[in-house]
């Protein structure tokens, strides 16, 4: 009779993490009598995965009933596969012996490869806000994928970025891998509504890449421009001065009026108008009683935006001449003004 051969028909098997791997093995004969064992690896360091004769192997089930007398199918299923299960599995026939069974024939081995999906990319921006024309760095991280091959791209508002550096760790072999990428982005005044996207493509994602996003609204600070104008006279002895605070982001803003260097009033931006680009405008009025002043008055609008050092704009109010109408510089976008006229 022809000598028993152990057949492992699959040279390789590819399984997604969490799924069940089927490792096929058949024998060509019932003789010699003896058990089958499955090992991961060969040589003296091989690991026992399943022993037909004895032992407890909770993750392993046999495909067919090994207790049946004529059974020659020794295929097994390994449940809940993780990347750590990758390796070559050998189906080994043992011959009954005394006191111990002896190894008789080994299959050619089946290489088990495990695919694991990358985690959703997490994009994080700088800790502190930056102003337009500055370059800021964004990082993107994704973990737990296998195999190592992966593609990462960066986009800003749909346009692919080229200034980035990517590392996949570890450099050697691992049960799973991580990717870390840093992209440099130059901010513009129009970036309040902009998005930075990190896109990760991996064989496990079947052409449907994972994306992580960061809103530049969390990163950008657009400093305001100030304009102080004198409005037409409201009463014989009163002058209305406005401070237009334009194109700022974020909204956090505090305005202080100074008369000849003395604090007159402080207020916080509340009823702001939003521009199409996501920046804000705000207007504050100050009603000045001219008759209370003997000399010319220097009015200063001082703005502290988002915790930054204050910026200011001044306007000289001539008291000696009779107050007349001086060009009102209001723009259409400034209609949402603050009408709390406090003196």
């Amino acid at each position: 009779e022809e000598e028993l051969q152990v057949i492992q028909p699959d040279k390789s098997v590819l399984v997604a993490a969490g799924e069940t791997a089927t490792l096929r093995c058949t024998a060509t004969s019932l003789i010699p009598v003896g058990p089958i064992q499955w090992f991961r690896g060969a040589g003296p360091g091989r690991e026992l995965i399943y022993n037909q004769k004895e032992g407890h192997f909770p993750r392993v089930t046999t495909v067919s009933d090994l207790t049946k007398r004529n059974n020659m199918d020794f295929s097994i299923r390994i449940g809940n596969i993780t990347p750590a299960d990758a390796g070559t599995y050998y189906c080994v026939k043992f011959r009954k012996g005394s006191p111990d069974d002896v190894e008789f024939k080994s299959g050619a081995g089946t290489e088990l490869s495990v695919r694991a999906k990358p985690s959703a990319p997490v994009v994080s921006g700088p800790a502190a806000r930056a102003t337009p024309q500055h370059t800021v760095s964004f990082t993107c991280e994704s973990h737990g994928f296998s195999p190592r091959d992966i593609t990462l791209k960066w986009f800003k508002n749909g346009n692919e970025l080229s200034d980035f550096q990517t590392n996949v760790d570890p450099v050697g072999e691992s049960v799973s891998y991580s990717i870390h990428s840093t992209a440099k982005v130059v901010l513009t005044r129009e970036d309040v509504h902009s998005q930075v996207i990190c896109e990760v493509a991996h064989v496990t994602l079947q052409g449907d890449p994972l994306r992580g996003t960061a809103n530049l609204s969390e990163t950008i600070r657009v400093p305001p421009t100030l304009e102080v104008t004198q409005q037409p006279v409201r009463a014989e002895n009163q002058v209305n001065v406005t401070c237009q605070v334009r194109k700022f982001y974020p909204q956090r803003l505090q305005l202080t009026w100074l008369e000849n260097g003395n604090v007159s009033r402080t207020e916080t931006a509340s009823t702001v108008t939003e521009n199409k680009d996501g920046t804000y405008n705000w207007m504050s009025w100050l009603l000045v009683n001219v008759s209370a002043h003997r000399d010319d008055v220097k009015l200063t609008c001082q703005v502290e935006h988002d915790g930054q050092p204050a910026v200011s704009k001044s306007h000289d109010l001539k008291v000696s001449a009779h107050p007349k109408e001086q060009g009102s510089n209001t723009a259409a976008e400034n209609t949402g003004s603050n009408e709390r006229n406090i003196y």
């Epitope: 011959r95 190894e103 050697g172």
Partner: antibody
Framework: QVQLQESGPGLVRPSETLSLTCTVS????????WSWIRQPPGKGLEWMGF???????FYNPSLKSRVTISLDMSMNQFSLKMTSVTAADTAVYYC????????????????WGQGTTVTVSS | DIVMTQSPLSLPVTPGEPASISCKSS???????????LDWYLQRPGQSPQLLIY???NRASGVPDRFSGSGSGTDFTLKISRVEAEDVGVFYC?????????FGGGTKVEIK
């Protein structure tokens, strides 16, 4: 093409510890044994020990109490540490890859490093 | 430990002529699966050893077919059908059945 490169000090003082690293490039660490073999000047080859991809180690009993082999798959490296060295440990140290695919035995040490000379002297 | 004994210690050869090296093990290297776990290596002067034969008779990749291995159990032989000048060096047998792996003392092949 798999290549192995040994690195470490060429001179070690008696009673100190010899530390060598072997960097594996161009191939996988999986499914192989990673071995250290030495050759004293003008003498034959002596197997020191090896480590499998699962971290299991096997040592030559004549050196076991002094030798530790470790594997860092993430760096594609494996290392040899030997304590309490004497002049008798002066040798060329080779790192090598050992194949295994046919049961309990081994199927050839098929890739060798170029060897690094270690002298034990004060 | 398995003791490996090689002979001869030195082998002067003539290019183009055959050569033969013997290796004996203190216990059988034939495992129950039918494989004989014996390797042959050649260490050329100033170089690292190179695998020639594994499992007693299987030629390693890239090894010229003038090298052949035979034997089983405890007696093994490496034959070179026609020696070439590049074959000079020390030939070692090594048992790969069990740890510690052990080498023979080596056979130095040199041109006459």
């Amino acid at each position: 093409q798999v290549q192995l490169q040994e690195s470490g000090p060429g001179l070690v003082r008696p009673s100190e510890t010899l530390s060598l690293t072997c960097t594996v490039s161009g191939g996988s660490i999986r499914n192989y044994y990673w071995s250290w073999i030495r050759q004293p000047p003008g003498k034959g080859l002596e197997w020191m020990g090896f480590i499998y991809d699962n971290g299991r180690t096997f040592y030559n009993p004549s050196l076991k109490s002094r030798v530790t082999i470790s594997l860092d798959m993430s760096m594609n490296q494996f290392s040899l540490k030997m304590t309490s060295v004497t002049a008798a440990d002066t040798a060329v140290y080779y790192c090598a890859r050992v194949r295994a695919y046919s049961g309990i035995g081994l199927d050839g040490t098929d890739v060798w490093g170029q060897g690094t000379t270690v002298t034990v002297s004060s | 430990d398995i003791v490996m004994t090689q002979s001869p210690l030195s082998l002067p050869v003539t290019p183009g002529e055959p050569a033969s090296i013997s290796c004996k093990s203190s216990q059988s290297l034939l495992y129950s699966n039918g494989y004989a776990y014996l390797d042959w290596y050649l260490q050329r002067p100033g170089q690292s050893p190179q695998l020639l034969i594994y499992q007693g008779s299987n030629r390693a990749s890239g090894v010229p077919d003038r090298f052949s291995g035979s034997g089983s159990g405890t007696d093994f032989t490496l034959k070179i059908s026609r020696v070439e000048a590049e074959d000079v060096g020390v030939f070692y047998c090594m048992q790969a059945l069990q740890t510690p792996l052990t080498f023979g003392g080596g056979t130095k092949v040199e041109i006459k």
